[in-house]
Interface confidence: medium
C-alpha cells in the first residue's frame, strides 16, 4: 500500500471547482442545522445567544448582488476560520454537558476544516490574491459555567448556520459570473 501519486491533478474548470465547493458547503450547512437542532432538543435556547468573539454576519442576502469573487472568498475564509477555532474551543472547554454532542461536533470540525482547505485551493486555482498569514489568534476565555458553555454552543452553531447559508447563496451567485 504505497503513497498516493504526488503530482496535483490538472486544474479543472473553475465553475466545476466552484460547484464542488458549493456541494461541500451545502453538506456542512445540513450538518450544522442538524447539530443545532440536536442542541436545542437537549438544551432549549431561551432567546438568541451571542458571543462577542464570533464574526459578524458577512452580508445580508439582499446585498449579495454587489459582491465580487475575491471579496466573498476572502471574507468567507476568515469567518469560517474563526468558526473552526470556536468549534475547537467548544470541544475543549465546553464542559461535560456538551460531550453529548460528540462525535457529531468532531465530524463538524473535520468537515469545516476540509471546506476551508477547499476554499484556499479554489482561491489559488482562480489566481486570486492570497491573504497575508493569520496572526496568532488570542486564546478564547473558558465559559464561566456549564450553562455558559451551552449558550456559547447555541451562538456558535447558530452563527455558523447563518454564515454557511450566506456562503451557499453567495457562491451560487458568483458562479453565474465566471
Amino acid at each position: 500500500p504505497g503513497p498516493p501519486p504526488g503530482p496535483p491533478r490538472v486544474s479543472p474548470d473553475p465553475r466545476a471547482e466552484l460547484d464542488s465547493t458549493v456541494l461541500l458547503t451545502r453538506s456542512l450547512l445540513a450538518d450544522t442545522r442538524q447539530l443545532a437542532a440536536q442542541l436545542r432538543d437537549k438544551f432549549p435556547a431561551d432567546g438568541d445567544h451571542n458571543l462577542d468573539s464570533l464574526p459578524t454576519l458577512a452580508m445580508s442576502a439582499g446585498a449579495l448582488g454587489a459582491l465580487q469573487l475575491p471579496g466573498v472568498l476572502t471574507r468567507l475564509r476568515a469567518d469560517l476560520l474563526s468558526y473552526l477555532r470556536h468549534v475547537q474551543w467548544l470541544r475543549r472547554a465546553g464542559g461535560s454537558s456538551l460531550k453529548t454532542l460528540e462525535p457529531e461536533l468532531g465530524t463538524l470540525q473535520a468537515r469545516l476544516d476540509r471546506l476551508l482547505r477547499r476554499l484556499q485551493l479554489l482561491m489559488s486555482r482562480l489566481a486570486l490574491p492570497q491573504p497575508p498569514p493569520d496572526p496568532p489568534a488570542p486564546p478564547l476565555a473558558p465559559p464561566s459555567s456549564a450553562w455558559g458553555g451551552i449558550r456559547a454552543a447555541h451562538a456558535i452553531l447558530g452563527g455558523l448556520h447563518l454564515t454557511l447559508d450566506w456562503a451557499v447563496r453567495g457562491l451560487l451567485l458568483l458562479k453565474t459570473r465566471l
Epitope: 503513497p3 504526488g6 473552526l84 470540525q109 473535520a110 477547499r118 484556499q120 492570497q130
Partner: antibody
Framework: QVQLQQSGGGVVQPGRSLRLSCAAS????????MHWVRQAPGKGLEWVAV????????YYADSVKGRFTISRDNSKNTLYLQMNSLRAEDTAVYYC????????????????WGQGTLVTVSS | QSALTQPRSVSRSPGQSVTISCTGT?????????VSWYQQHPGKAPKLMIY???KRPSGVPDRFSGSKSGNTASLTISGLQAEDEADYYC??????????FGGGTKLTVL
C-alpha cells in the same frame, strides 16, 4: 531517487537573520508541497511551516509567525526558509521535507526528509 | 498547539512486540485521521513508517502497524529486531494547515 540537500545553517546572534536552502532532485519538485520541521537539541520534532506545490499557499506555526518566511523557486528546484529576528529558542536542526502528494491537501504527511542543518542562535 | 504525549522510553527483547502510545486532544488526534509515525536513528533524518493512522508506505515491513482509538493513536511493532532500536515520533494534523508532533519515544531492544 529523492534527494533533499540542505545548506545555510550556522551560528548567528539573537535578533539577526539567516536563510536556509533545500535543493531537491530525483522528483518533479514543482508538483509537491514542502514542509520545514525543526528539532531542538535533545528534544522532539516541531512543525515550522508548509508551502503548497506552486508557492501560493503558506502556513506557519505560531512560534515563528511573523518572523520566518517559507518560499520556493520551482525553476531552481529549491525551497527556502528566511529566518528573521532569531531567538535562542530557535536553536535546532532544521529539516526540509517533502509532502507525499498535493491535491486537496488530504496527504500532507511527509514522506522524505533532508539531512538537516543546524542553526545555533547564541551571543 | 501542545505536543502530543508519548512515553519517554520503552524497552523489549528481540522477537517481542511493543506498542507506543500517542495521546492528543479532541482537536487533533481525536478529530483527524491524519496521524503519522516516524522512526529516527541517532544523527539521521526521520523516516516515515505509518501515515493516515494505519497505512504503510511501500518498503516498510508489515511488522509495523498503526491504530487509533479516541484521542490516542498507537504504533505496534511485532517481532522486534535489533535495527528497530530508534526514536519514534507521532505526528497529527491539528486543523487548518497546522501539525503537531509527539515528544518522541526511545525504543531500546535489549
Amino acid at each position: 531517487q529523492v534527494q533533499l540537500q540542505q545548506s545555510g545553517g550556522g551560528v548567528v546572534q539573537p535578533g539577526r537573520s539567516l536563510r536556509l536552502s533545500c535543493a531537491a532532485s530525483g522528483f518533479t519538485f514543482s508538483s509537491y508541497g514542502m514542509h520545514w520541521v525543526r528539532q531542538a537539541p535533545g528534544k522532539g520534532l516541531e512543525w515550522v511551516a508548509v508551502i503548497s506545490y506552486d508557492g501560493s499557499n503558506k502556513y506557519y506555526a505560531d512560534s515563528v509567525k511573523g518572523r520566518f518566511t517559507i518560499s520556493r523557486d520551482n525553476s531552481k528546484n529549491t525551497l527556502y526558509l528566511q529566518m528573521n529576528s532569531l531567538r535562542a529558542e530557535d536553536t535546532a536542526v532544521y529539516y526540509c521535507a517533502r509532502i507525499m502528494g498535493y491535491d486537496y491537501g488530504d496527504y500532507d504527511v511527509v514522506d522524505y526528509w533532508g539531512q538537516g542543518t543546524l542553526v545555533t542562535v547564541s551571543s | 498547539q501542545s505536543a502530543l504525549t508519548q512515553p519517554r522510553s520503552v524497552s523489549r527483547s528481540p522477537g517481542q512486540s511493543v506498542t507506543i502510545s500517542c495521546t492528543g486532544t479532541s482537536s487533533d488526534v481525536g478529530t483527524y485521521n491524519y496521524v503519522s509515525w516516524y522512526q529516527q536513528h541517532p544523527g539521521k533524518a526521520p523516516k516515515l513508517m505509518i501515515y493516515d493512522v494505519s497505512k504503510r508506505p511501500s518498503g516498510v515491513p508489515d511488522r509495523f502497524s498503526g491504530s487509533k482509538s479516541g484521542n490516542t493513536a498507537s504504533l505496534t511493532i511485532s517481532g522486534l529486531q535489533a535495527e528497530d532500536e530508534a526514536d519514534y515520533y507521532c505526528c497529527s494534523y491539528a486543523g487548518f494547515y497546522t501539525w503537531v508532533f509527539g515528544g518522541g519515544t526511545k525504543l531500546t531492544v535489549l
